[in-house]
Interface confidence: low
Amino acid sequence: GITIPRNPGCPNSEDKNFPRTVMVNLNIHNRNTNTNPKRSSDYYNRSTSPWNLHRNEDPERYPSVIWEAKCRHLGCINADGNVDYHMNSVPIQQEILVLRREPPHCPNSFRLEKILVSVGCTCVTPIVHHVA
Amino acid sequence: GITIPRNPGCPNSEDKNFPRTVMVNLNIHNRNTNTNPKRSSDYYNRSTSPWNLHRNEDPERYPSVIWEAKCRHLGCINADGNVDYHMNSVPIQQEILVLRREPPHCPNSFRLEKILVSVGCTCVTPIVHHVA
C-alpha cells in the first residue's frame, strides 16, 4: 500500500482500543453540491425494469432513513409496454457503510456497519440451465 | 422525531464540538454475512444495459477503494445482441457515506463525507421532446 507520513497536527488518541476507535466529525462534507437531487428521479418509472422505492427507517442508525428499491416485475417491460418473462428484472445491490449507535441510544458513540441495499433494477437475460 | 432516552452507560463527551464529533468503532459489523459475495457479479455483463466497473482508489478515504460503474453503450442491447439507440443505458447513482481523513494523513481522525457513485446501469425509454 501507499505509505503516507503522519500529519504532526493529528489529534492524539490515548484510547486503549486505538486504532479501532476514531474521532469522526459528523458535519458532513457533500462532494455533490452541484448535482441535481432529481438527477435520476424518473429512472425508476422509465426503466424497462421499473422499481418502487421503500423507506427504511431506523433511529439507531445514521443515516436513519435509507430508500430500498424493489423491482415491480419478475420480467422486463417490452416495446409494447407488456411484461416479457423471457427477461428478468433484478435488483442492483451495493454494500454501504452506516453508523450504528453503540451502546444503543447513545448520541455520541457509534460502530461502523456494512449493510446491503438495493439501489435500482436492471433487466438481464436469464441463465438457462439445460438438462442433459 | 422519535425521542429515545439516553443510555446511562454512554461514553462521556467533553468535546467542545459535541455532538458534531463522535467516537466510532471501525471494527465493522457486517450485516450481510449470509449474502453471496457473487450475488450480482454477472449482472454487469448479462444486463441489456451492460456496464464496466472502474476502480477508484483514495488512501485518504475509508473505504479506500470504491468501484464505479460506467455504462458500455449509449443504447441498450436488443434481442439480437445489437445496440438499440431507441433506448438509453443510464447509470443508477446513489449517495453514500465515506470517511475522509481530516486533517489529512491522520490515522484516527475523520470527517463524514457524502459522495455520488454509479452502482450499475438500467435501460430507460428516452424522453422525447416534441417541438410545438
Epitope: T35 | K70, L74, G75, N78, N82, V83, D84, Y85, N88
Partner: antibody, heavy 115, light 107 residues
Framework: EVKLVESGGGLVRPGGTLKLSCAAS????????MSWGRQTPEKRLEWVAF???????YYPDSVKGRFTISRDNVRNILYLQMISLRSEDTAMYYC?????????WGQGTLVTVSA | DIQMTQSSSYLSVSLGGRVTITCKAS??????LAWYQQKPGNAPRLLIS???SLETGVPSRFSGSGSGKDYTLSITSLQTEDVATYYC?????????FGSGTKLEIK
C-alpha cells in the same frame, strides 16, 4: 498506431448526394463503435451519425432520414451516405473512433453544398 | 437538447502562466464531459473524458474538474504548443453537443 483517413468530399449542388469513406487501420475495427462528426465554416462542431460495433445506428434530428452510416468490417471502412444535401451541411466531415466521444479523429474531408 | 456554453471565446495568457477554460451545461450532465484541443488545420484531439480523466499521452499540465452543470479545463505552465481552440462536449444526453470553443492565444 490508430489511423483514420476520410475521402469522398467535394462540391455538390443543394439536393445532391455524396458518399464519404473512412479507411481505418491500427486497431481491430470490427470491435469498435464509430462516428461521423462535422465542423462548419463557423467552427461549430456537431456529431451526425454513430454506429455500434454490432451495427446499430443513431442520428440526430438534423440529419435523420438524409444521412446513412454503414461499415464494412472486412475492408475496415466506415461510410456516410448523404442525400438531399442542404447549404447548412457545408462542413469538414470527420470520422472518429468512439460512440459517446471521439477518442481518435481522422484529418477530415471537406463537403461544400452550393448552387 | 443540452446547450454547452463556453463563456470566453478568446483567452490571452502569458507563457508559463495558468489558464482556466470554463464550460457550462444547460442541464446536469453528471461528469459525462469531454475536452478537445484543436490546432489550426488539424482535427480535434481528445484530452479528457469523464470530466477529469486524462487521455494517454496528454501532458499532466492539463487537468479537468467540475460536477453538475459546471466544468473547467485547467492548463498550468502554458507552453507555445498549447495555442489552440478548446472545445467541451457533453455525452450525457442525445444529441451530444459541443461548446462553441475557446481560442487560446499567447500574450
Amino acid at each position: 498506431e490508430v489511423k483514420l483517413v476520410e475521402s469522398g468530399g467535394g462540391l455538390v449542388r443543394p439536393g445532391g448526394t455524396l458518399k464519404l469513406s473512412c479507411a481505418a487501420s491500427g486497431f481491430t475495427f470490427s470491435s469498435f463503435d464509430m462516428s461521423w462528426g462535422r465542423q462548419t465554416p463557423e467552427k461549430r462542431l456537431e456529431w451526425v451519425a454513430f454506429m455500434s460495433s454490432g451495427g446499430s445506428t443513431y442520428y440526430p434530428d438534423s440529419v435523420k432520414g438524409r444521412f446513412t452510416i454503414s461499415r464494412d468490417n472486412v475492408r475496415n471502412i466506415l461510410y456516410l451516405q448523404m442525400i438531399s444535401l442542404r447549404s447548412e451541411d457545408t462542413a469538414m466531415y470527420y470520422c472518429a473512433r468512439g460512440e459517446r466521444y471521439g477518442s481518435y479523429w481522422g484529418q477530415g474531408t471537406l463537403v461544400t453544398v452550393s448552387a | 437538447d443540452i446547450q454547452m456554453t463556453q463563456s470566453s471565446s478568446y483567452l490571452s495568457v502569458s507563457l508559463g502562466g495558468r489558464v482556466t477554460i470554463t464550460c457550462k451545461a444547460s442541464d446536469h450532465i453528471n461528469n459525462w464531459l469531454a475536452w478537445y484541443q484543436q490546432k489550426p488545420g488539424n482535427a480535434p484531439r481528445l484530452l479528457i473524458s469523464g470530466a477529469t480523466s486524462l487521455e494517454t499521452g496528454v501532458p499532466s499540465r492539463f487537468s479537468g474538474s467540475g460536477s453538475g452543470k459546471d466544468y473547467t479545463l485547467s492548463i498550468t505552465s502554458l507552453q507555445t504548443e498549447d495555442v489552440a481552440t478548446y472545445y467541451c462536449q457533453q455525452y450525457w444526453s442525445t444529441p451530444f453537443t459541443f461548446g462553441s470553443g475557446t481560442k487560446l492565444e499567447i500574450k
